[in-house]
């Protein structure tokens, strides 16, 4: 009868999350009698696994009939493998005694645990930026083992480069996060536009996981402020109108000012969406000049998103001549811009109408 | 520590039947077999038969086939051994016994069971 | 089936001296590399005690006085110095097949 020997003869063993482990252990000899136990980890602080002789270890099954004559197998099955089962596993062989005494341990088979990375989530910044400005966005990925991956970002389906990547811990771990950032420069065009961000695993069969984020959550388009005036009608009214052009979002304010004061305030709402994302929206407001012995001076004063107001004036002349000779009376706009601390730039060209 | 502890003595008529129970502690019940044996005053041992509680597979002495019946309550760790249509010499102490090493021996042992027949 | 058949029936032997008893089964109980051989002690009033499994290997706690050995059909338990509380009636079991028990051996001191 040969000296016992405990047999495990697979060093390592990789499994996926929520399968079933087979960790196999075999003894050459009957002699001595005792239980096998299965520990995970070495040392005091082992833990224990499986006791064939007592405790109720629900997740682990023995392969053979512990009660099977002649058995020297002594192979586990845990079900349901989680990241956390990720470890170095011992069969070990006690000679029964009072208590049963350690007699030979196994060499030891590693378990890992192929995990799945989670759905990576991409958040955006806190608050809206500008075109021209640079945005950073992050994504999250967490609960994946082994430990290599790979994350790449997009934008609009063309891969960006300037983003950077941690996978943590850097240490050995039971299972991994990743975290990218990546900084995008937005344009005036990417309300339309989306951030993709793609991560690559072993355990997803070369079908990546994506995450999105939309730019439209991320930017905001401000307005260009156009004035046009109709010629006057016969009742000696002049419509103007304030043409906003080009936003976005669409929490937009309108006031108009006569000289000053508040004439009419409007929130903007279900506006047709241009095709780039963006809105247009016209106000109006008609003008009684007979009403007035000077000039009118108009103001279109624009709320956009939360940010300072931007005005754009307009002065409608109104004729020194009184009406019934048949005097002319002109409207002008004199195309100024007050900006307050915005940077919107004025495209606008002055207008000068002349209306008889 | 293993422990096997039997039911009280039982005194019978011949004809009757008696159940013995065995309740096991100290280790997982369904990992060992139980063998019963008994032994008649001054006499040697007798094997019975033994059962797995895991599965109630069992094996009797072809002397004691007919008569006995061993079950087990794994819900308490039970086991039992029925012996029917008794008679004068099945006056014994009866042993239950926990095979440890499956090798179809007797490791630990209850204190012991006595049965009497008598009319 | 396999009959075991031990021998003497009864030993008287003086303290400190060598006590031998011998088991011959009708048949080979070697299987599996193995002798399914095993041998109990029973003190008076009290239960059997595993001594020896599988013809040589001791169990946990037996004193090394007490020894097996054989193979195939004949076997033997040796206590290689007598002491007081050894006085028993040894029994030998086979389990090649279903278990059965030699019908035992009466030690006392002479």
């Known amino acids: 009868e040969e000296e016992l020997q405990v047999i495990q003869p697979e060093k390592s063993v990789s499994v996926a999350a929520g399968e079933s482990a087979t960790l196999n252990c075999t003894a050459t000899s009957l002699i001595p009698v005792g239980p096998i136990q299965w520990f995970r980890g070495v040392g005091p602080g082992r833990e224990l696994i499986y006791h064939q002789k007592e405790g109720h270890f629900p997740r682990v099954t023995p392969v053979s009939d512990p009660t099977k004559r002649n058995n020297m197998d002594f192979s586990i099955r845990i079900s349901n493998i989680t990241p956390a089962d990720a470890g170095t596993y011992y069969c070990v062989k006690f000679r029964k005694g009072s208590p049963d005494v350690e007699l030979k341990s196994g060499a030891g088979t590693e378990l890992s645990v192929r995990a799945k990375p989670s759905a990576p989530v991409v958040s955006g910044p806190a608050v809206r930026a500008t075109a021209e400005h640079t945005v950073s966005f992050t994504c999250e990925s967490h609960g994946f083992s082994p430990r290599d991956i790979t994350l790449k970002w997009f934008k609009n389906g063309n891969e960006l480069s300037d983003f950077q990547t941690n996978v943590d811990p850097a240490g050995k771990s039971v299972s991994y996060s990743i975290r990218s950032t990546a900084r995008v420069v937005l344009t005036r065009r990417d309300v339309h536009s989306q951030v993709i961000c793609e991560v690559a695993h072993v355990t997803l069969q070369g079908d990546p996981l994506r995450g999105t984020a939309n730019l439209s959550e991320a930017i905001r388009v401000p307005p260009f402020l156009e004035f046009t005036q109709q010629s006057m009608r016969a009742d000696n009214q002049v419509n103007v109108t304030c043409q906003v052009m080009k936003f976005y979002p669409q929490r937009l304010q309108l006031t108009w000012l006569e000289n000053g004061n508040v004439s009419r305030t409007e929130m903007a709402s279900a506006l047709p969406e241009n095709k780039d994302g963006t809105y247009n929206w016209t106000s109006w407001l008609l003008v009684n000049v007979s009403a007035h012995r000077d000039d009118v001076k108009l103001t279109c004063q624009v709320e956009h998103d939360g940010q300072p107001a931007v005005n754009k004036s307009f002065s409608v002349k109104v004729s020194a001549h009184p009406k019934e000779q048949g005097s002319n009376t002109a409207a002008e706009n004199t195309g100024t811009n007050e900006r307050g601390s915005s940077d919107y730039k004025d495209d606008d060209d002055k207008h000068h109408h002349h209306h008889h | 520590q293993v422990q096997l502890v039997q039911s009280g003595a039982e005194v019978k008529k011949p004809g009757a039947s008696v159940k013995v129970s065995c309740k096991a502690s100290g280790y997982t019940f369904t990992n060992y077999w139980i063998n019963w044996v008994r032994q008649a005053p001054g006499q040697g041992l007798e094997w019975i038969a033994m059962?797995?509680?895991?599965?109630?597979?069992?094996h009797y002495n072809q002397i004691f086939k007919d008569r006995a019946t061993l079950t087990t309550d794994t819900s308490t760790s039970t086991a039992y051994m029925e012996l029917r249509s008794l008679r004068s010499d099945d006056t014994a102490v009866y042993y239950c016994?926990?095979?440890?090493?499956?090798?179809?021996?007797?490791?630990?042992w209850g204190r012991g069971t006595l049965v009497t027949v008598s009319s | 089936d396999i009959v075991l058949t031990q021998s003497p029936d009864s030993l008287a032997v003086s303290l400190g001296e060598r006590a031998t008893i011998n088991c011959r089964a009708s048949?080979?109980?070697?299987?599996?590399?193995?002798?399914?051989i095993f041998w109990y002690q029973q003190k008076p009033g009290q239960p059997p005690k595993l001594l020896i499994y599988l013809a040589s290997n001791r169990d946990s706690g037996v004193p090394d006085r007490f020894s097996g050995s054989g193979s195939g059909t004949d076997f033997t338990l040796t206590i290689s110095s007598l002491q007081a509380e050894d006085v028993a009636v040894y029994y030998c079991q086979e389990s090649r097949e279903l278990p059965t028990f030699g019908q035992g051996t009466k030690l006392e001191i002479k």
């Open positions: 059962i797995d509680p895991s599965d109630s597979e069992t």
């Open positions: 016994a926990m095979d440890y090493g499956s090798l179809y021996a007797m490791d630990y």
């Open positions: 048949q080979s109980v070697r299987s599996s590399g193995y002798n399914w």
